[in-house]
Interface confidence: medium
């Protein structure tokens, strides 16, 4: 199968995040996360969904911080 990116969301970042999602991703969809490289022009947290999609998010958003905290604790 193929997984396509969409103009409606910042999917499949290569190394850096240039845009952030404007949607709060449902927590139950998220499998993992990683921080983008510190040399990127913008900071980013990339959430990986249970279907393998990667989504750029803003590390300043409270929901992003809450999700990271939750995943670290669990």
């Amino acid at each position: 199968t193929k997984t396509e990116s969409s103009s409606r969301g910042p999917y499949h970042p290569s190394e850096c995040c240039f845009t952030y999602t404007t949607y709060k991703i449902p927590r139950q969809r998220i499998m993992d996360y990683y921080e983008t490289n510190s040399q990127c022009s913008k900071p980013g947290i990339v959430f990986i969904t249970k279907r393998g999609h990667s989504v750029c998010t803003n590390p300043s958003d409270k929901w992003v911080q809450d999700y990271i905290k939750d995943m670290k604790e669990n």
Epitope: T1, T3, Q28, K50, R51
Partner: antibody, heavy 123, light 113 residues
Framework: QEQLKESGGGLVQPGGSLKLSCKAS????????MSWVRQAPGKGLEWIGY????????AYASWVNGRFTISSHNAQNTLYLHLNSLTAADTATYFC????????????????WGQGTLVTVSS | AIVMTQTPASVEAAVGGTVTIKCQAS??????LAWYQQKPGQPPRLLIY???TLASGVPSRFKGSGSGTQFTLTISDLECADAATYYC???????????????FGGGTEVVVK
């Protein structure tokens, strides 16, 4: 009551196109993935693809080869399947299904199905 | 792509009896397997997900087990209403290729005498 209802099926000529709809009611449409699954007469189930209604991201079975496109209109709680370059082999009942994530791992399962809409490709 | 092989294709049993359906995955899928029941002219109905968790409203006569590549659906105390075709299904995601796919087994017809 949670419900899915497909429409748009019918008789179409080989090489033709069709747009199927699936209206959701009774649940938050964008909270889960939505899939299309088909079943040829007397045959088994065959997954076509899914959409993430939040982002519009899609994934398809390899055999689809770009002939089918899944989209959604979240405000109308409606899922669509655009069928192109149809052949007799595409004759089937097409089901939409809510595609629920597993709590702890990759992928999901189909916990709500529509009744299906029959597409017949014949000249 | 992952392949789900279901056996047998058809099975016959008496009311009150027990039926066992097997589903084999071509590679490990952990416990990410679901079972569905489909009667003629109806859509499939979810019975079991995560290999062994009973879906809402499904009687405990239906039991799912297994993990990795080998899975089993057991229907005990068979009723006439259990006559249907049963399918297994998984979603397989490959981290290496970053693609996912749903796969169904070929189905098993259960005939209740």
């Amino acid at each position: 009551q949670e419900q899915l209802k497909e429409s748009g099926g019918g008789l179409v000529q080989p090489g033709g196109s069709l747009k199927l709809s699936c209206k959701a009611s009774g649940f938050a449409f964008s909270s889960d993935y939505m899939s299309w699954v088909r079943q040829a007469p007397g045959k088994g189930l065959e997954w076509i693809g899914y959409i993430d209604p939040i982002f519009g991201s899609t994934a398809y079975a390899s055999w689809v080869n770009g002939r089918f496109t899944i989209s959604s209109h979240n405000a109308q709680n409606t899922l669509y399947l655009h069928l192109n370059s149809l052949t007799a082999a595409d004759t089937a009942t097409y089901f939409c299904a809510r595609d629920k994530d597993y709590s702890s791992g990759w992928g999901g399962y189909f916990n709500l199905w529509g009744q299906g809409t029959l597409v017949t490709v014949s000249s | 792509a992952i392949v789900m092989t279901q056996t047998p294709a058809s099975v016959e049993a008496a009311v009150g009896g027990t039926v066992t359906i097997k589903c084999q995955a071509s590679q490990s899928i952990n416990s990410y397997l679901a079972w569905y029941q489909q009667k003629p002219g109806q859509p499939p109905r979810l019975l079991i997900y995560e290999a062994s968790t009973l879906a809402s409203g499904v009687p405990s006569r239906f039991k799912g087990s297994g993990s990795g590549t080998q899975f089993t659906l057991t229907i005990s105390d068979l009723e006439c209403a259990d006559a249907a075709t049963y399918y297994c299904q998984t979603y397989y995601y490959s981290v290496d290729s970053s693609v996912g796919s749903n796969a169904f087994g070929g189905g098993t017809e259960v005939v209740v005498k």
